[in-house]
Interface confidence: low
């Protein structure tokens, strides 16, 4: 699990931000049916209740809000739009709400919202605008701090043409929008590839979850400019190797803790590097618990104990006896 | 390319009501705001109300409530406004704008909308 | 509701001038939702300037923009003709949003 922040500590300290006007401002405290509001907690919680729209009555006080395990569908533009605004809105948790589409400016009017988890829905349509703004042509800040999207692949039937990797990623960059943020999961999301570039513009990440994903190489992924990076979980991957850039990206961040256990590390020839920096680094925790699985000969070996002698690749064979 | 286009200008008599639209183009109609602006000639812009068409969420300035009545299409990608009880005050050039808190970045061409008998 | 003062009402400017329009507010606005429109006789308003100072697409570098609180500017480094145009500014801060009552920028 992450070391998200708990809810009641956030602040609202985020500038007023200007949203839609309701006709009567709610009673501050009224509670919307089918919810349970404490305002001691600042907290709402409207759980289980197959709700399909998020309520339009929420109190002014809440800074907590709950809204697990309904039945969304869709998070249109300012679905979260009131005048006055939600303005002490820090913590919006929509995980297993069966929300397939987040559209352009979904969050917009949350001045404070600094977490916001949406784990646990099959987005089939997530806008690229919709951490940015309800603009076309303009983006500012997302006051989001902890972004957590953890198992948000829809099923095949359901997917988009277009990749999920791109989508998730045009979303996570549009208008630089969060820039701000220090956590971001995304585990769980069957990701073959992390898009180029994305994490160029998550610049203040602390915190970045991509565990549990079927990722087969970091080759193009920059964490260069990832300066503040404390922790990267790539545990449950498909990754073979890391690879000299990778390995020299890693080791130059002064704060990093990588996890990198239950790949299908081959150990042949080109695992010399790595091996050569396990032993020497302090960056990977857990590094001796990672293992070969290929090829065969080398399955449940330690990395940390093999050495060059160890690492061989096989002769290339002439074609006539080349097998698949 | 994005564009609202808006409907013909209107003649109307004192007391009468009027039903205007914008129909957008080139963006995903429910992905943002409409807005509806007034323009008195020779005068200063007055913002009248905004919908969320994704969710038909409709916000009104009080000065305009009971009398405007916003409403959209999503099937026709069009948004109306209505205004009832008609005086000459409210002969004007109305706009529809598309955008959100960080400004109206496309506007239609605006209707003209004449209050006369 | 916050009321947004505009001043000068009129202004003539000679070609290569320095411009400066005014915009204050009758209480604080966050420089975020603070914009400026450039509009010309018989056009729809055009989005100049958002969040206080960044330029809408299209707009010419010579334009910029400033403040914060209640005081807020727009500069034309170099007026030039096709500047000669009415400029409103408007605050999404609070409802009922606002604009000022315009400001018109005439070549002299």
């Known amino acids: 699990s992450s070391p998200t922040s708990s809810a009641s500590s956030f602040s609202s300290s985020a500038p007023f931000l200007a949203s839609a006007a309701s006709a009567q401002p709610p009673l501050p405290d009224q509670c919307p049916a089918l919810c349970e509001c404490s305002e001691a907690a600042r907290t709402v919680k409207c759980v289980n209740r197959n709700l399909t729209e998020v309520p339009t009555d929420l109190p002014l006080y809440v800074r907590n809000l709950f809204l697990t395990g309904n039945q969304l569908a869709v998070l249109p533009a300012g679905a979260f739009a009131r005048r006055p605004p939600l303005a002490e809105l820090a913590a919006l948790n929509l995980s297993g709400s069966r929300l397939d589409e987040v559209r352009a400016g979904a969050f917009e009017h949350l001045p404070s919202l600094r977490q916001l988890d949406l784990s646990h829905n099959p987005l089939a349509y997530l806008s690229p605008f919709a951490f940015s703004g309800s603009n076309a042509s303009i983006s500012a800040p997302s006051p989001l701090v902890e972004l957590i999207l953890n198992h948000i692949v829809p099923p095949d039937d359901k997917r988009q043409n277009r990749s999920f990797e791109g989508m998730v990623a045009a979303a996570l960059v549009a208008g630089r929008a969060l820039q701000g943020l220090h956590l971001l999961e995304l585990a769980s999301n069957h990701f073959l590839y992390l898009p180029r570039d994305v994490l160029a513009q998550l610049p203040s990440l602390r915190y970045l979850d991509l565990s549990n994903n079927s990722l087969v190489s970091l080759t193009y992924v920059s964490f260069r400019n990832l300066t503040h990076l404390e922790s990267l979980h790539l545990e449950d991957n498909a990754l073979k190797v890391l690879h000299n850039g990778t390995l020299a990206e890693l080791q130059g961040l002064p704060h990093v803790r990588v996890f990198l256990d239950n790949n299908p590390w081959v150990c042949d020839c080109h695992m010399a590097d790595m091996v050569t920096w396990l032993k020497q680094t302090e960056v990977v925790q857990g590094k001796d618990r990672l293992t070969c699985a290929f090829p065969e000969k080398m399955r449940n070996r330690v990395l940390l104990e093999l050495n060059s002698a160890d690492l061989d690749c096989d002769p290339i064979l002439p074609p006539s006896l080349q097998t698949s | 390319q994005v564009q609202l286009q808006q409907s013909r200008p209107e003649l109307v008599k004192p007391g009468a009501s009027v039903k205007m639209s914008c129909k957008a183009s080139g963006y995903t109609f429910t992905d943002y705001v409409i807005s509806w602006v007034k323009q008195r000639t020779g005068q200063g812009l007055e913002w009248i109300g905004e919908?969320?068409?994704?969710?038909?969420?409709?916000y009104y300035n009080e000065k305009f409530k009971g009398r405007a009545t916003l409403t959209a299409d999503k099937s026709s990608s069009t948004a109306y406004m209505q205004l009832s009880s008609l005086t000459s005050e409210d002969s004007a050039v109305y706009f529809c704008?598309?955008?959100?808190?960080?400004?109206?970045?496309?506007w239609g061409q605006g209707t003209t909308l004449t209050v006369s008998s | 509701q916050i009321v947004l003062t505009q001043s000068p009402a009129i202004m003539s400017a000679s070609l290569g001038e320095r411009v400066t329009l005014t915009c204050t507010a009758s209480?604080?606005?966050?420089?975020?939702?603070l914009h400026w429109y450039q509009q010309k006789p018989g056009s729809s308003p055009k989005l100049w300037i958002y969040?206080?100072?960044n330029l809408a697409s299209g707009v010419p570098a010579r334009f910029s923009g400033s403040g914060s609180g209640t005081s807020y500017s727009l500069t034309i480094s170099s007026m030039e003709a096709e500047d000669a145009a009415t400029y409103y500014c408007?605050?999404?801060?609070?409802?009922?949003?606002?604009f000022g009552a315009g400001t018109k920028l005439e070549l002299k």
């Open positions: 919908i969320y068409p994704g969710s038909n969420s409709i």
């Open positions: 408007h605050q999404y801060h609070r409802s009922p949003l606002t």
């Open positions: 969040s206080t100072s």
């Open positions: 209480s604080s606005v966050n420089s975020n939702y």
């Open positions: 704008a598309m955008g959100g808190n960080y400004g109206f970045d496309y």
